[in-house]
């Protein structure tokens, strides 16, 4: 008996061939001997089966002695043995229909788990193997689970169902809802305008939800909500914003915040959360602000940074085109009695300058 695997919702074509290459009478029945489909001349005839409006054939093939049974919009319960009767002979085909679906939704938040469930006909014992977009393989029986979804899990999952040495392939598009970056650092000189951007790693037609930016300033004892906003069909509207600092927010995606001035009291780290409509859980992105200030007070030239810096960052003071006068893994450096000229304060990581502030020291008479 020939075995054919089908996918729920798809179309399958079961073949039946006569030795005579001409249009002759045929009919297809199910295992209960209920007539599904046959022919009379150039026309199709249909029996009282459940497949009535989903069964078809190809009249163009009849005169070649081919009498296929086409079943559209396959259902699991279409799994059965189908019998083609033609020229006093019977051809049997066993059809097994499988379905593979994602647990709730194919749009999942980063960190959530994905469960794929296999629907299969009674008596079958299939095995399933799925390959994620990043090439990770998972195997299982009726259910497959992947915990802690990552951004790289977004894309097409290819799942192969094996039964009777035959296989059928499913493709499921999974969208992991997340920000493009989990964390970002903005380095600014005191007084500069600060731009915070929170690009999303996915695109959906309609995006609705609400969000908030909480800020923990380095100098403050507790965190504070800087701004709350709503998102409706990709349009952003501010609900509430603090007086200090007075943040501005872009009206369109990607989420964009502007801080008029970088000041030492704002240096710190923030957490932007976005709650999407009809989703449990929130999207998070951490953002950090490092502020630099270079000052000269009497005979003391000082360079300071505020905010979350890594211990391996180097802070240096140097006269233009000269070697660094002072260079330390600290958040403040100074030079006493600096000579006249253009001094540079540099914050660098392994030789790469992250932030630079220039200050002119005038000659003392």
């Amino acid at each position: 008996k020939k075995v054919v695997l089908g996918k729920k919702g798809d179309t399958v074509e079961l073949t039946c061939t006569a030795s005579q290459k001409k249009s002759i009478q045929f009919h297809w029945k199910n295992s209960n001997q209920i007539k599904i489909l046959g022919n009379q001349g150039s026309f199709l005839t249909k029996g009282p089966s459940k497949l009535n409006d989903r069964a078809d054939s190809r009249r163009s093939l009849w005169d070649q002695g081919n009498f296929p049974l086409i079943i559209k919009n396959l259902k699991i319960e279409d799994s059965d043995t189908y019998i083609c009767e033609v020229e006093d002979q019977k051809e049997e085909v066993q059809l097994l229909v499988f379905g593979l679906t994602a647990n709730s939704d194919t749009h999942l938040l980063q960190g959530q788990s994905l469960t794929l469930t296999l629907e299969s006909p009674p008596g079958s014992s299939p095995s399933v193997q799925c390959r994620s977009p990043r090439g990770k393989n998972i195997q299982g029986g009726k259910t497959l689970s992947v915990s802690q979804l990552e951004l790289q899990d977004s894309g097409t999952w290819t799942c192969t169902v094996l039964q009777n040495q035959k296989k059928v392939e499913f493709k499921i598009d999974i969208v992991v809802l997340a920000f493009q970056k989990a964390s970002s650092i903005v380095y600014k000189k005191e007084g500069e305008q600060v731009e915070f951007s929170f690009p999303l790693a996915f695109t959906v037609e309609k995006l609705t939800g609400s969000g908030e930016l909480w800020w923990q300033a380095e100098r403050a004892s507790s965190s504070k909500s800087w701004i709350t906003f709503d998102l409706k069909n990709k349009e952003v509207s501010v609900k509430r914003v603090t007086q200090d600092p007075k943040l501005q927010m872009g009206k369109k995606l990607p989420l964009h915040l502007t801080l008029p001035q970088a000041l030492p009291q704002y240096a710190g780290s923030g957490n932007l959360t976005l709650a999407l409509e009809a989703k449990t859980g929130k999207l998070h992105q951490e953002v950090n602000l490092v502020v630099m200030r270079a000052t000269q007070l009497q005979k003391n030239l000082t360079c300071e940074v505020w905010g979350p810096t890594s211990p391996k960052l180097m802070l240096s003071l140097k006269l233009e085109n000269k070697e660094a006068k002072v260079s330390k893994r600290e958040k403040a450096v100074w030079v006493l009695n600096p000579e006249a000229g253009m001094w540079q304060c540099l914050l660098s990581d392994s030789g790469q300058v992250l932030l630079e502030s220039n200050i002119k020291v005038l000659p003392t008479w």
């Epitope: 001349g41 150039s42 026309f43 199709l44 005839t45 009535n52 409006d53 078809d56």
Partner: antibody, heavy 121, light 108 residues
Framework: QVQLVQSGAEVKKPGASVKVSCKAS????????INWVRQATGQGLEWMGW????????GSTQKFQGRVTMTRNTSISTAYMELSSLRSEDTAVYYC??????????????WGKGTTVTVSS | EIVMTQSPATLSLSPGERATLSCRAS???????LSWYQQKPGQAPRLLIY???TRATGIPARFRGSGSGTDFTLTISSLQPEDFAVYYC?????????FGGGTKVEIK
């Protein structure tokens, strides 16, 4: 050109039979079905059945089974439809139409002008 | 048997207007098996469309067929004087072949 020429109008009494002919020309008669469709005055079209001129195989709707006979004479490229046990509701125009099977498509592309059959006592 | 229902029964329009005729099948059929015919008073029907959307030989482009499943449509983009007639849809998904009751397109 391709055409189907039908026999003339008939007036019949209830219980009688009528035989309508349909002569094909301009194409190979045995390559296409001949379908029979009727239309009562002011009413819609009603398909009755068909004959395959090549094999002689026929088929008709359940409504007419036992009362309708569809035949053909290939030597004169003519198809016939005979309806017996006539009743007044069989009063209608009877059309023959060529049935074309092109790939998976089937359609009636050439029609006769129709034969009026009146059943009246 | 599959019952074909056409609507509206009558459509009153002026030349140049767009006509939209509907045909609904009592069960889902493949678009392969849907034809449209035109019939003028005292004449035999004439094939317009087969396979739901393929125009028959010599049929002007203003006639357009569409649809799938149970709902099919014949659209005449700009009615010409010669288009005022009765239009029938017909299925050959399986025996018996059945016609719709027809839609009469008349001059307003």
């Amino acid at each position: 050109q391709v055409q189907l020429v039908q026999s003339g109008a008939e007036v019949k009494k209830p219980g009688a039979s009528v035989k309508v002919s349909c002569k094909a020309s301009g194409y190979t008669f045995t390559s296409y079905d001949i379908n029979w469709v009727r239309q009562a005055t002011g009413q819609g079209l009603e398909w009755m059945g068909w004959v395959n001129p090549n094999s002689g195989n026929t088929g008709s709707t359940q409504k007419f089974q036992g009362r309708v006979t569809m035949t053909r004479n290939t030597s004169i490229s003519t198809a016939y439809m005979e309806l017996s046990s006539l009743r007044s509701e069989d009063t209608a125009v009877y059309y023959c139409a060529r049935g074309v099977l092109k790939g998976d498509y089937y359609y009636m592309d050439v029609w006769g002008k129709g034969t009026t059959v009146t059943v009246s006592s | 048997e599959i019952v074909m229902t056409q609507s509206p029964a009558t459509l009153s329009l002026s030349p140049g207007e767009r006509a939209t005729l509907s045909c609904r099948a009592s069960q889902s059929i493949s678009s392969t098996y849907l034809s449209w015919y035109q019939q003028k008073p005292g004449q035999a029907p004439r094939l317009l469309i087969y396979g739901s959307s393929t125009r028959a030989t010599g049929i002007p482009a203003r006639f357009r067929g569409s649809g799938s499943g149970t709902d099919f449509t014949l659209t005449i983009s700009s009615l010409q004087p010669e288009d005022f007639a009765v239009y029938y849809c017909q299925q050959d998904d399986h025996l018996p072949l059945t016609f719709g009751g027809g839609t009469k397109v008349e001059i307003k």
